[in-house]
Interface confidence: medium
């Protein structure tokens, strides 16, 4: 009896979730490519573009210790992290910036996200750069489905991260104070929707309960990663 309403609810929840970034901020950062595989010594282009109203843009490498790779602002000498000094070129303007990283090394592998300074914190969807030794390049390929960009206002109350380059902007106080509640509701609904989706279509995870004895009810769970590859890249966590 509860089946049909659940089915009707799912598209609604998914549509709501997809619309959330746009509702929270008028701007997005379009970032491309979402994933690229290059051999050692090669170059890669990352393009960050916004609809305007931009004050500056950071390219940030995510990870346990996130760090800013570059800061670019029209009319100002760009700042480049020493690790990439002499290996970065820029073309375009801050609203449509192409960053070229040259002479890539294995250690440059990672996710790079554009972070725009506007009236809110706006993040690109991220670019996963896989730097491989030439002979192994065939093992790593990127898929086509790009992740969505995210645009989240930074709440005006405080907290800390390991690496302190900053940027948030002037949030509308009423909207900012309503944001945590809105996010909580959306997260709950999204979780509910995903739960329903998993119940309806349990094709990805195959439970192989190979054995059970009287002392154990263990069930080994295997996840089918056969077509994941770069699809696993998701919108970067702005708390990193």
């Amino acid at each position: 009896m509860a089946g049909p309403p659940r089915l009707l609810l799912l598209p609604l929840l998914l549509a709501l979730a997809r619309g959330l970034p746009g509702a929270l901020a008028a701007q997005e950062v379009q970032q491309s490519p979402h994933c690229t595989t290059v051999p050692v010594g090669a170059s890669v282009n990352i393009t960050c573009s916004t609809s305007g109203g931009l004050r500056g843009i950071y390219l940030r490498q995510l990870g346990p210790q996130p760090q800013d790779i570059i800061y670019y602002e029209d009319g100002v000498v760009p700042t480049t992290d020493r690790r990439f000094r002499g290996r970065i070129d820029f073309s375009g303007s801050q609203d449509n910036l192409t960053i070229t990283m040259h002479r890539l090394q294995l250690s440059d592998t990672g996710t790079y996200t554009c972070q725009a300074i506007t009236e809110v914190n706006v993040y690109g969807s991220g670019t996963l750069v896989l730097v491989t030794e030439e002979q192994s390049q065939g093992w790593h390929r990127c898929s086509d489905a790009p992740p969505r960009a995210s645009a989240l206002p930074a709440p005006p109350t405080g907290s800390a991260l390991p690496d302190p380059q900053t940027a948030s902007a002037l949030p509308d106080p009423p909207a900012a104070s309503a944001l945590p509640a809105a996010l909580a509701v959306i997260s709950f609904l999204l979780g509910l929707g995903l739960g329903v989706a998993c119940v309806l279509a349990r094709t990805q995870i195959k439970k192989l309960c190979s054995w059970r004895d009287k002392n154990s009810a263990a069930c080994v769970v295997y996840e089918d990663m056969s077509h994941s590859r770069c699809n696993t890249l998701s919108s970067p966590n702005q708390y990193q």
């Epitope: 500056g56 800061y71 380059q165 948030s168």
Partner: nanobody, 117 residues
Framework: QVQLQESGGGLVQPGGSLRLSCAAS????????MGWYRQAPGKQRDLVAS???????TYADFVKGRFTISRDNAKNTVYLQMNSLKPEDTAVYYC???????????WGQGTQVTVSS
């Protein structure tokens, strides 16, 4: 991590001026977008003004035309010049890393600004 120390607050009469300073220690200051924030008793902390590494500034509507944010990268310092102060500007003023301020668990001590006759 950039450590921040605010100073320059005090008691001032309505219409008066103050200049706040925020000294930062840490090698990342020159690339940081910095912000001044304020928190009045019983209210949330609000962003007052921010400045990018290149000097691009933004102000909250309630201080536009009265406050000016500036920075000196050589001294690792960001300033807030406050003119035409009003009683409603009374608050503790903090500076912080603008992009991460909404995520920080810690803030400096801040500097108290009291506007009263």
């Amino acid at each position: 991590q950039v450590q921040l120390q605010e100073s320059g607050g005090g008691l001032v009469q309505p219409g008066g001026s103050l200049r706040l300073s925020c000294a930062a220690s840490g090698s990342k200051f020159s690339i940081a977008t910095m912000g001044w924030y304020r928190q009045a008793p019983g209210k949330q902390r609000d962003l007052v003004a921010s400045i990018t590494p290149g000097g691009n500034t933004t102000y909250a509507d309630f201080v536009k035309g009265r406050f000016t944010i500036s920075r000196d990268n050589a001294k690792n310092t960001v300033y807030l010049q406050m003119n035409s102060l009003k009683p409603e500007d009374t608050a503790v003023y903090y500076c912080n890393d603008f992009r991460l301020a909404g995520l920080r668990d810690y803030w400096g001590q801040g500097t108290q600004v009291t506007v009263s006759s």
